[in-house]
Interface confidence: low
């Protein structure tokens, strides 16, 4: 298994092209510091399948390894946060997927409520070879303490193995978890032996087993759940930032965006640009590209702003500040015009002009 | 257990606009892993996905190409429910609607289906 | 697009399969769904060949290359139905459906 490591340098190669990538709905996966992570890319079995953040390729490392469609971040930290792109390269085109990842300290426990690792999980035995319920993969059930924030989703896994093949029931508190327990009810993933909540509230703390069992015996694992109860909101974006702006061809220009989150943000500066002379994929998503993003020695203030230097007409455009942390994401929009020189450099603001 | 109950006139006036409503149980509109959509069936076109709604610390919205000028779909979190709208119908549109569920990327519950019929 | 044969038939008992294809449909991943005359489709296979609780066992599915195939081993005349494959579009904004195939049980 070839093993990856999240590369902190944030500038795109120039000559990459342009990729679709929709602003407003990238799947955000949130994890805990230390905990580990594991992010599914949708394109599935491609030939080659590449993974960058912020635009840069993953390169080598024991806390980050590829499987297949899954990138697993072990231990993670705080500067794992950032845009990853998965991209299946196929022989006629390549398609790209996105998503968010936060580490931060206040997060659900569980991962995407879909997780697909059932490979590992499901052991097929020989229909000779009785045996009772056994563990198949403790690592996932080491974190018996989940304290998750109101409103997130949370997932308990008991991945067992026996023959024949056990069957899997929950209770809560010792008594039988039935889906009208709780407004929304509960997802069972049996394939991957899994119990999701999603959008939990302070009545859905306290204790939650698994009971795994057959013909030959039962066992049983214990979760503990704690609904922290807080206000959260994606992050905020002062308004009027970033503005529109003009310069002349030559001179020089910034874009300041301000950024308010409670959660730790990733703040990414993002160009419209053209591809074979449309600003739009046949799907009607915008094509963009990462110009600047938070890396390891980059600070807040200096994600904030964006500084374009010697500035020529094919600078002009559209360009976006994206924030996102771990409840959400929001972006501004401010457009740039790019003049003659008239012999002199002159730089002019114009009045604000954002999405939202 | 998640039910859609689907709800709203089976006879439209062509040029006039298409309204269903979907009753969610045993979820929440609001959920923030789930999205509400309409499909539509008809014996010309099959199973044709219209759009959804959901949300995520804001709500948005998707709709396919083919009724993006006509249609729109709103929640109703204080009823626990979701509409659909599609104006300026045409016999072209008459088919049996339904609302559903998804947890990405599959459909896992659907309402019992709204025969709608745009006849003058 | 998707494009699934019209019509299967099969002998009660005999294994069944309905094919579903599309450019690369391999590289996503495939849903199935059954619908019975008067009802609403019911999902059977999710992500190429998982089963939703309460679904037999004699369903099962694949998905590689450009076809995704539906199996019913053991065919009974209760699986009578129409099926339909769906998967979905770039970056999953639009979903697609197969025109469906009639699954008849001699």
């Known amino acids: 298994r070839p093993s990856f490591s999240l590369v902190e340098d944030t500038t795109l190669e120039p000559e990459e092209p342009p990729t679709k990538y929709q602003i407003s709905q990238p799947e955000v996966y949130v994890a805990a510091p230390g905990e580990s992570l594991e992010v599914r890319c949708l394109l599935k079995d491609a030939a080659v399948i590449s993974w960058t953040k912020d635009g840069v390729h993953l390169g080598p490392n024991n806390r980050t390894v590829l499987i297949g469609e899954y990138l697993q971040i072990k231990g993670a930290t705080p500067r794992d946060s950032g845009l990853y792109a998965c991209t299946a390269s196929r022989t006629v085109d390549s398609e790209t997927w996105y998503f968010m990842v936060n580490v931060t300290d206040a997060i659900s426990s569980g991962d995407d409520e879909d997780d697909t690792d059932g490979a590992e999980d499901f052991v097929s035995e020989n229909s000779n070879n009785k045996r009772a319920p056994y563990w198949t993969n403790t690592e996932k059930m080491e974190k018996r303490l989940h304290a998750v924030p109101a409103a997130n989703t949370v997932k308990f896994r008991c991945p067992a193995g026996g023959n024949p093949m056990p069957t899997m029931r929950w209770l809560k508190n010792g008594k039988e978890f039935k889906q009208e327990h709780r407004i929304g009810g509960y997802k069972v993933r049996n394939q991957h032996w899994s119990l999701i909540m999603e959008s939990v509230v302070p009545s859905d703390k306290g204790n939650y087993t698994c009971v795994v069992e057959n013909e030959y015996g039962s066992i049983n694992h214990t979760y503990h759940l704690d609904v922290v109860e807080r206000s959260p909101h994606r992050p905020i974006l002062q308004a009027g930032l970033p503005a529109n702006a003009s310069t002349v061809v030559g001179g020089d220009v910034e874009f300041v965006c301000k950024v308010y989150s409670d959660a730790q943000p990733h703040i990414q500066w993002i160009k419209h640009v053209e591809k074979n002379g449309s600003k739009y994929g046949p799907d009607g998503l915008p094509y963009l590209k990462v110009l600047k993003a938070a890396g390891v020695n980059t600070t807040d203030k200096e994600i904030e702003v964006l500084y374009i230097r010697n500035v020529t007409f094919e600078d002009a455009g559209e360009y976006t500040c994206l924030a996102g942390n771990s409840i959400g994401i929001s972006f501004h929009s401010a457009w740039l015009t790019v003049l003659p020189a008239p012999g002199r450099e002159k730089e002019i603001t114009a009045s604000p002009d954002y999405l939202e | 257990m998640v039910q859609l109950q689907q709800s709203g006139p089976g006879l439209v006036k062509p040029s006039q606009t298409l309204s269903l409503t979907c009753a969610i149980s045993g979820d929440s509109v609001s959920s923030n892993s789930a999205a509400w959509n309409w499909i539509r069936q008809s014996p010309g076109r099959g199973l044709e996905w219209l759009g959804r709604?959901?949300?995520?610390?804001?709500?948005?919205?998707d709709y396919a190409v083919s009724v993006k000028s006509r249609i729109t779909i709103n929640p109703d979190t204080s009823k626990n429910q979701f509409s659909l709208q599609l104006n300026s119908v045409t016999p072209e549109d008459t088919a049996v609607y339904y609302c559903?569920?998804?947890?990405?990327?599959?459909?896992?519950?659907w309402g019992q289906g709204t025969l709608v019929t745009v006849s003058s | 697009e998707l494009t699934q044969p019209p019509s299967v038939s099969v002998a009660p008992g005999q294994t069944a399969r309905i094919s579903c294809s599309g450019d690369a449909l391999g590289d996503k991943y495939a849903s199935w769904y059954q619908q019975k005359p008067g009802q609403a489709p019911v999902l059977v296979i999710y992500d190429d060949s998982d089963r939703p609780s309460g679904i037999p066992e004699r369903f099962s599915g694949s998905n590689s290359g450009n076809t995704a195939t539906l199996t019913i081993s053991g065919t009974q005349a209760e699986d009578e139905a129409d099926y339909y494959c769906?998967?979905?579009?770039?970056?999953?904004?639009?979903?697609?459906f197969g025109g469906g195939t009639k699954l008849t049980v001699l």
């Open positions: 769906q998967s979905y579009a770039s970056q999953g904004i639009h979903y697609v």
């Open positions: 709604t959901y949300y995520r610390s804001k709500w948005y919205n």
């Open positions: 559903a569920r998804s947890y990405y990327p599959d459909f896992d519950y």
